[in-house]
Every structure is written in structure tokens, then in C-alpha cells.
């Protein structure tokens, strides 16, 4: 059974992930972002279901295309280089989803823009955090 300390750690990691995703979304939506139109042409795959931490596998698998899109953006829109930002997210995701069970991600048939993709995972984090508090 999860202890209060492990629940607290999970909550903190989710809050960190949430902040990173929100920072990316804000950087992309920045009205000074000249590459927004181009960035919105990238296709992202959405999970059919995202209700548990194991479903973060679906986010992990999309981190490479996410980095590719961020490489288009001006670096001043973000505090970190895309590679470092994605690396940080990857570390958190790996810790949160755990490596004990191998979960095969199932994707929806429709693709999403980067904005829709980020909003989906922001909602996911907020939802899990709310169940922990």
C-alpha cells in the first residue's frame, strides 16, 4: 500500500511535470512566437485512455517529437534548452510510471496539435493530483 511519504513524492513529481508542461504551453502560445503556425502542423498522438500513472507511457513515447517541435521555437521562450527540458520531463515520467510493469500504449485514431497534446497531459496531471490531495 502507498505510504503518505510516497504519495507526497508522487504529488510533488506530478506538480513538477505539470509546471514543465504549462511552461512549454505558455512558451508556444506566446504572442511573439513567430513559429507558432509551423509548430501547429506537427502531429501528436493522443492516448485512448489516460487515467493512471502507467498511462504516462503514452507521454514518454511522444517526447521525441515534442523536442523536435520545441527546437523550432526561439530559445528565449523557455528557461531551458529543449533537450534539457525534455530530459527533465523524461526523468519525472520514468519515475512516475515505474519500470516494473510494461504497458503498451494505445493511441486514438485522430492526431492532435501540440497545444491539444499539452492540454491533454496538463489535464491528466491535474486530475491525478486532485485524487492524491
Amino acid at each position: 500500500a502507498p505510504t503518505s511519504s510516497s504519495t507526497k513524492k508522487t504529488q510533488l513529481q506530478l506538480e513538477h511535470l505539470l509546471l514543465d508542461l504549462q511552461m512549454i504551453l505558455n512558451g508556444i502560445n506566446n504572442y511573439k512566437n513567430p513559429k507558432l503556425t509551423r509548430m501547429l502542423t506537427f502531429k501528436f498522438y493522443m492516448p485512448k485512455k489516460a487515467t493512471e500513472l502507467k498511462h504516462l507511457q503514452c507521454l514518454e513515447e511522444e517526447l521525441k517529437p515534442l523536442e523536435e517541435v520545441l527546437n523550432l521555437a526561439q530559445s528565449k521562450n523557455f528557461h531551458l534548452r529543449p533537450r534539457d527540458l525534455i530530459s527533465n520531463i523524461n526523468v519525472i515520467v520514468l519515475e512516475l510510471k515505474g519500470s516494473e510493469t510494461t504497458f503498451m500504449c494505445e493511441y486514438a485514431d485522430e492526431t492532435a496539435t501540440i497545444v491539444e497534446f499539452l492540454n491533454r497531459w496538463i489535464t491528466f496531471c491535474q486530475s491525478i493530483i486532485s485524487t492524491l490531495t
Epitope: T41, K43, E68, E110, T111
Partner: antibody, heavy 122, light 107 residues
Framework: EVQLVQSGAEVKKPGESLKISCKGS????????IGWVRQMPGKGLEWMGI????????RYSPSFQGQVTLSADKSISTAYLRWSSLKASDTAMYYC???????????????WGQGTTVTVSS | DIQMTQSPSSLSASVGDRVTITCQAS??????LNWYQQKPGKAPKLLIY???NLETGVPSRFSGSGSETDFTFTISSLQPEDIATYYC?????????FGPGTKVDIK
């Protein structure tokens, strides 16, 4: 090896329909946009349109919109170019090509099929 | 649509010569430009992407430069196997238009 293999040459009469194919291998076919390019005899290259095989999203050049239809079957890693009623002016070599970056079409085309010759004559 | 023009439309040069082709876009395309080589009876081949990046496996005698509306493609030392038609293509805006091509042959 990343490859696009196109269907063989076609000889058709005006008014007939035709569907030519482009099969991808050696890479994740669904993750890259596929473009189609026309080359009329002795002429230059003309960009026709693109399709994303994962969800069959398409973009057409205004010059080809309504003239041709792009489609894809991701289960067999194949993209298609179709005419419902051919004209003599459709006589050309047609190439399919993969967009280099994947996920977005804003990249150049790096891998090309060998081309399919279409001849339309009465 | 963005119009692409190339010059010259054809050229003859000797083996070992430096060959330069220019490509002009009707509006700013940043560095979103490719150069392709098409040999007779063959499919086009990508040589240069993003105006100046050499595609993997392409000989270093090929190079590209330029940004915005004016671009240059150079073969530093022409070889017999370089006989082909060279096309520029923009991918700043749909539709991704090609230049009319430059036919290169040996004197």
C-alpha cells in the same frame, strides 16, 4: 533500408479511372507525410499534394485540388494517388516522396519512389 | 503561391569547373529551401536541405547558401556524374513549389 516502391506503368484511355500506389518500408510509415509530384514529359517537377498516413490528413496544391484524390492504407504501409476520369493531359511520370522530418510537412522530401509512368491516349 | 525562379536555365561547363546556380523566391522563405538533382530517367535526389545542409552521403563538392529570397547552389569541381537537372524547392508555404530547373552538362 528506407524505400518507397511504386506500382508499374499504366496505359489508359481518356475518361477511365486509375489508382497508383506507393509502398513504404524500412521506417515507420504512419509517422511521415508522403508527397506526390508530377513530371510531364520533358518538363519540370510539380508539387501535387501530401498525405499523413496515420490519420489520412491531406493537403492539395490548388492546381490539383479536385483533379486527383490522395489516400493511404496504414495497415499495408501504402499511399495512393487516384483519378476518377483521366485526361490526355494527365500523361506524366508521378513520384511519391517522403517528407524528411516526419510529423510535420514543413520539411523537404528525402526518399523518393522510382516513379510511375501514366500514359493516357485514345 | 510562392514563385521560384532559377538561373541559368541550362549551362555547359568543363570537368573541374566551379558551377553556380541561383534560385530566387517571390517572397521571404527564410532558409526553407531544398536542392534536388535529377539524372535522366531517374527520380530526383535530395542534395541540400534548409538551404545549406548537406544530405547524408552527398559529396562535399555540393553546397548551398542564402536566405530569405536569394539562394545559391554550387558544385565546387564539376564531375562527369554531375550531368543532371537541378531543382530548388521552397517549403515555407503550401503549396511547396519547385523552381523550373537548371540543366547542367559537360562541354
Amino acid at each position: 533500408e528506407v524505400q518507397l516502391v511504386q506500382s508499374g506503368a499504366e496505359v489508359k484511355k481518356p475518361g477511365e479511372s486509375l489508382k497508383i500506389s506507393c509502398k513504404g518500408s524500412g521506417y515507420s510509415f504512419t509517422d511521415y507525410w508522403i508527397g506526390w509530384v508530377r513530371q510531364m514529359p520533358g518538363k519540370g517537377l510539380e508539387w501535387m499534394g501530401i498525405i499523413y498516413p496515420y490519420d489520412s490528413d491531406t493537403r492539395y496544391s490548388p492546381s490539383f485540388q479536385g483533379q486527383v484524390t490522395l489516400s493511404a492504407d496504414k495497415s499495408i504501409s501504402t499511399a495512393y494517388l487516384r483519378w476518377s476520369s483521366l485526361k490526355a493531359s494527365d500523361t506524366a511520370m508521378y513520384y511519391c516522396a517522403r517528407h524528411r522530418g516526419g510529423r510535420s510537412y514543413y520539411y523537404g522530401m528525402d526518399v523518393w519512389g522510382q516513379g510511375t509512368t501514366v500514359t493516357v491516349s485514345s | 503561391d510562392i514563385q521560384m525562379t532559377q538561373s541559368p536555365s541550362s549551362l555547359s561547363a568543363s570537368v573541374g569547373d566551379r558551377v553556380t546556380i541561383t534560385c530566387q523566391a517571390s517572397q521571404d522563405i527564410s532558409n526553407y529551401l531544398n536542392w534536388y538533382q535529377q539524372k535522366p530517367g531517374k527520380a530526383p535526389k535530395l542534395l541540400i536541405y534548409d538551404a545549406s545542409n548537406l544530405e547524408t552521403g552527398v559529396p562535399s563538392r555540393f553546397s548551398g547558401s542564402g536566405s530569405e529570397t536569394d539562394f545559391t547552389f554550387t558544385i565546387s569541381s564539376l564531375q562527369p556524374e554531375d550531368i543532371a537537372t537541378y531543382y530548388c524547392q521552397q517549403y515555407e508555404n503550401l503549396p511547396f513549389t519547385f523552381g523550373p530547373g537548371t540543366k547542367v552538362d559537360i562541354k
